[in-house]
């Protein structure tokens, strides 16, 4: 339901100092400037709601312009413990410690936080991305090496008067950015401790955080141009659905992806796109300024609402799911990559979704809010939307219960 309760001090209003504090682009992530140590060392840090470690490059790497030098910080404390984080592809490993951390364009506070000093990595840092570390904003349950390592945001809330909430406005440019343009461009805003009304239009609609590990939510229905995909809603959340600023694409479970692509293909059948386009391998291009946005459908995800049997929908445009790409070989054209892809780990609402909306991570009330972003890319005919309420029954059945594999927690 919409957020119409009385204003609470410090929770909403204007956060001028934090507006426009993000840079980057959806393909390589959005980052915020942070300082670590004493004297402060400035680093650009990827904002990632899909993980829970604060980890920074702490050794030379070919893709890093700078890195955290622990030996130069008088406030660094070694925890004498290693951390190893493998991904499906790639990994990083490092040494745990704590140090003083602040966000120059954030709340005027300094906190002592856990820091993983990355000493070795593979397929983690991105050449040309301009960030040197990652700020995992999710919950302790998925922190490495285990849930006893307090995430940065928990430390921030515990040690200061900052309310337990943050909000993100990620602004896709709508056109490709070269390196110098990224450095000069505005990428969006991370409002720590509140909601800034200037960053969205219309009302905020909230969906419950199903479980505090990832920012897990429940999708109850999917539509392509208003046509229901008509799948068992469990499929949409198999094995989970999360909101993840550190992922570029909208990633969908295999069955859902196949159904969605079939429907998007059918809706856009006036043009014949190569199979490689739907796989994310081939670009499609049009003469500059002639992209036929109208032939591509809108995509609506219905999310569980805060009230029983009530849902709301968020609708994205092709301007969100076709990602502009610069390729010198085809520079006279506007070229795009299909930014919806297949997942084996559930639905991931990445930058493709988030660039359409102002997203409020209201940890205090265990909910995530969505409103139409004031910076989303659209055309004169269609706009991204957040609409409700809709009546949806048996929404609890849409959640998938991951089988418990840890014997210590099995009932005997």
């Amino acid at each position: 339901e919409t957020d119409e309760e009385p204003e609470e001090p410090g929770r909403r209003g204007s956060f001028v100092e934090m507006v426009d504090n993000l840079r980057g682009k959806s393909g390589q992530g959005y980052y915020v400037e942070m300082t670590v140590g004493s004297p402060p060392q400035t680093l650009n840090i990827l904002v990632d709601t899909g993980s829970s470690n604060f980890a920074v490059g702490a050794a030379p790497h070919p893709f890093l312009h700078r890195y955290y030098q622990r030996q130069l910080s008088s406030t660094y404390r070694d925890l004498r413990k290693g951390v190893y984080v493998p991904y499906t592809q790639g990994k990083w490993e490092g040494e745990l410690g704590t140090d003083l951390v602040s966000i120059p364009h954030g709340p005027n506070v300094t906190v002592r936080a856990n820091i993983a000093a990355i000493t070795e990595s593979d397929k983690f840092f991105i050449n040309g991305s301009n960030w040197e570390g990652i700020l995992g904003l999710a919950y302790a349950e998925i922190a490495r090496p285990d849930d006893s390592l307090e995430p940065f945001f928990d430390s921030l809330v515990k040690q200061t008067h900052v309310p337990n909430l943050f909000s993100l406005q990620l602004c896709g440019a709508g056109f490709p950015l070269n390196q110098s343009e990224v450095l000069a461009s505005v990428g969006g805003s991370m409002i720590i401790g509140g909601i800034d009304h200037s960053l969205y239009t219309g009302s905020l609609w909230y969906t419950p955080i199903r479980r505090e590990w990832y920012y897990e939510v429940i999708i109850v229905r999917v539509e392509i141009n208003g046509q229901d995909l008509k799948m068992d809603c469990k499929e949409y959340n198999y094995d989970k659905s999360i909101v993840d600023s550190g992922t570029t694409n909208l990633r969908l479970p295999k069955k859902v992806f196949e159904a969605a692509v079939k429907s998007i293909k059918a809706a856009s059948s006036t043009e014949k796109f190569p199979d490689g386009f739907w796989l994310g391998e081939q670009l499609v291009c049009w003469q500059a300024g002639t992209t036929p946005w109208n032939i591509f459908p809108v995509i609506s995800l219905y999310l569980m609402g805060e009230v029983t049997n009530q849902s709301f929908r968020i609708t994205i445009l092709p301007q969100q799911y076709l990602r502009p790409v610069e390729d010198v070989a085809t520079s006279q054209d506007d070229c795009y990559k299909f930014a919806i892809s297949q997942s084996s780990t559930g639905t991931v609402m990445g930058a493709v979704i988030m660039e359409g909306f102002y997203v409020v991570f209201d940890r205090a009330r265990k909910r995530i809010g969505f409103a139409v972003s004031a910076c989303h890319v659209h055309d004169e005919f269609r706009t991204a939307a957040v609409e409700g309420p809709f009546v949806t029954l048996d929404m609890e059945d849409c959640g998938y219960n991951i089988p418990q594999t840890d014997e210590s927690t099995l009932m005997t």
């Epitope: 050449n127 043009e271 014949k272 796109f273 190569p274 670009l283 390729d327 085809t330």
Partner: antibody, heavy 116, light 107 residues
Framework: EVQLQQSGAELVRPGTSVKLSCKAS?????SYWIHWVKQRPGQGLEW???????????KYNQKFKDKATLTVDTSSSTTYMHLSSLTSEDSAVYYC?????????WGQRTLVTVSA | DIVMTQSQKFMSKSVGDTVSVTCKAS??????VAWYQQKSGQSPKSLIY???HRYSGVPDRFTGSGSGTDFTLTISNVQSEDLADYFC?????????FGGGTRLEIK
């Protein structure tokens, strides 16, 4: 400037294997797939397969799925093609090429000669 | 697999002429066809994508046309440096396939 630098010519014995490399520069390596193409003397071009450097996902031409294995090392922006159980039929020029729309960029060629 | 047929293996033209190289797909590939030029001992060079779009830096003497199953590469005002093999490629579906090539000789 986008460049694909391939490894040098190989003279190999029948029944053995060979690993060719293709080092990319001038663009964000993980943003574009890399393809491999075979050309036998005086013949046309055959697509072997492709790899997505962002997650190592591969797709092969059925004809080459037991012959070629594609891998990637993002730390060095290099793609590899391993060719196994070599016969005279595998004597050819091999190219890597980068995705975009079709194959806008090609490597400079690697000649593989299989001979006893 | 989609078969791309270039029926003319050789073509001979004089400098200044116009030449049309044709390519036929065994099934509808939309406009998802590219053309490449390969000079002796060199790698293929990309000329045309999406049937009719020139890659950056390709002279406008090279034009592509066609859709569905029939495609043409036209080279107007042929120059001596155009001596090469020309290949079409469909990238509509996997496996990607190439035509057998057409060799342009200069009289």
């Amino acid at each position: 400037e986008v460049q694909l630098q391939q490894s040098g010519a190989e003279l190999v014995r029948p029944g053995t294997s060979v690993k060719l490399s293709c080092k990319a520069s001038g663009y964000t390596f993980t943003s574009y797939w890399i393809h491999w193409v075979k050309q036998r003397p005086g013949q046309g071009l055959e697509w072997i397969g492709m790899i997505d450097p962002s997650d190592s996902y591969t797709k092969y031409n059925q004809k080459f799925k037991d012959k070629a294995t594609l891998t990637v090392d993002t730390s060095s922006s290099t793609t590899y093609m391993h060719l196994s159980s070599l016969t005279s039929e595998d004597s050819a020029v091999y190219y890597c090429a980068r995705s975009g729309v079709a194959f806008p960029y090609w490597g400079q060629r690697t000649l593989v000669t299989v001979s006893a | 697999d989609i078969v791309m047929t270039q029926s003319q293996k050789f073509m001979s033209k004089s400098v200044g002429d116009t030449v049309s190289v044709t390519c036929k797909a065994s099934q509808d590939v939309g406009r998802n066809v590219a053309w490449y030029q390969q000079k002796s001992g060199q790698s293929p060079k990309s000329l045309i994508y999406s049937a009719s779009h020139r890659y950056s830096g390709v002279p406008d003497r090279f034009t592509g046309s066609g859709s569905g199953t029939d495609f043409t590469l036209t080279i107007s005002n042929v120059q001596s440096e155009d001596l090469a093999d020309y290949f079409c490629q469909q990238y509509n579906s996997y496996p990607y396939t190439f035509g057998g090539g057409t060799r342009l000789e200069i009289k």
